[in-house]
């Protein structure tokens, strides 16, 4: 069967070759071919070309529509991983490392501390903070994680907040806080995560992360 198929393919290929060769000869005006024969072959060839071009145009249209749709509403998403910092600042530091996401330049990680968006819209913003603390070693105040927003020309403000009391486990007990919500962001708005004691934050793989997704 396979051999018969091969012979069939070769025969078709040969016919195509003869057809193309005939068109060539028609174009060079070889005497051995009748004018009628040439006209027939030419119109046949034009028909093929027309079909190919129409097909190509349709595909092009579909693709350009897809592109327009994509351009108007591109996926905007980011997921960054916590980074231990020597700075004493209460704002957590993040990095594009490990299994991170940065969809395109419509969202950027600035100064390793804030995610900044270029497009206005509704965003789901989330953060997970894992910390290890001990009641005796810590102050009376609970461990608080805050998700904050900084809009151009305005003060930062708290969007979400969660608090956990310190563990009695020794040397310290691991606990996780998850924050997440949907917020309207303006172009140039930045979001960041603030904690009461950054030295207690766990930076092991998967423990502490931060991200957003445009809806």
């Amino acid at each position: 069967h396979r051999r018969l198929d091969k012979i069939e393919d070769e025969r078709n290929l040969h016919e195509d070759f003869v057809f193309m060769k005939t068109i060539q000869r028609c174009n060079t005006g070889e005497r051995s071919l009748s004018l009628l024969n040439c006209e027939e072959i030419k119109s046949q060839f034009e028909g093929f070309v027309k079909d190919i071009m129409l097909n190509k145009e349709e595909t092009k249209k579909e693709n350009s529509f897809e592109m327009q749709k994509g351009d108007q509403n591109p996926q905007i998403a980011a997921h960054v991983i916590s980074e231990a910092s020597s700075k004493t600042t209460s704002v957590l530091q993040w990095a594009e490392k490990g299994y991170y996401t940065m969809s395109n330049n419509l969202v950027t990680l600035e100064n390793g501390k804030q995610l900044t968006v270029k497009r206005q819209g509704l965003y789901y913003i989330y953060a997970q903070v894992t910390f290890c603390s001990n009641r005796e070693a810590s102050s009376q105040a609970p461990f608080i994680a805050s998700l904050c927003l900084k809009s151009p020309g305005r003060f930062e403000r708290i969007l979400l907040r969660a608090a956990n009391t310190h563990s009695s486990a020794k040397p310290c007990g691991q606990q996780s806080i998850h924050l997440g919500g949907v917020f309207e962001l303006q172009p140039g708005a930045s979001v960041f995560v603030n904690v009461t004691d950054p030295s207690q934050v766990s930076h092991g793989t998967g423990f502490t992360s931060f991200g957003l997704l445009k809806l």
Epitope: S90, V91, C148, G153, R154, F155, E156, I158, N194
Partner: nanobody, 120 residues
Framework: EVQLLESGGGLVQPGGSLRLSCAAS????????MSWVRQAPGKGLEWVST????????YYADSVKGRFTISRDNSKNTLYLQMNSLRAEDTAVYYC?????????????WGQGTLVTVSS
């Protein structure tokens, strides 16, 4: 009712230090930016420093940059101004001011002020 009560002023020698405090009540302290503004004898008001609601961002007048440090303790509803390397020209009444919501430059409430005198 919003109340801002400054304390910590006094007489200090040039090069010395002072720490001013401002106890706030009557509003959700952690939601507002807070500022220090001063008025030297016979002069107009001069903005000194501002701190954002959760204390992440601070702003200073060029005349005090590197010498003064603004801070806040939201759990105690208190604003601070640590003043180091004081000069004679820092002599003034220092006012604690509450910034209008989401504005860095507008103040809607002021304290009574505390006098700082820098003199040898």
């Amino acid at each position: 009712e919003v109340q801002l009560l400054e304390s910590g002023g006094g007489l200090v020698q040039p090069g010395g230090s002072l720490r001013l405090s401002c106890a706030a009540s009557g509003f959700t302290f952690e939601e507002y930016g807070m500022s220090w503004v001063r008025q030297a004898p016979g002069k107009g008001l001069e903005w000194v420093s501002t701190i954002s609601p959760i204390g992440v961002t601070t702003y200073y007048a060029d005349s005090v940059k590197g010498r003064f440090t603004i801070s806040r303790d939201n759990s105690k509803n208190t604003l601070y101004l640590q003043m180091n390397s004081l000069r004679a020209e820092d002599t003034a009444v220092y006012y604690c001011a509450k910034n209008a919501y989401d504005r860095k430059s507008n103040f809607d409430y002021w304290g009574q002020g505390t006098l700082v005198t820098v003199s040898s």
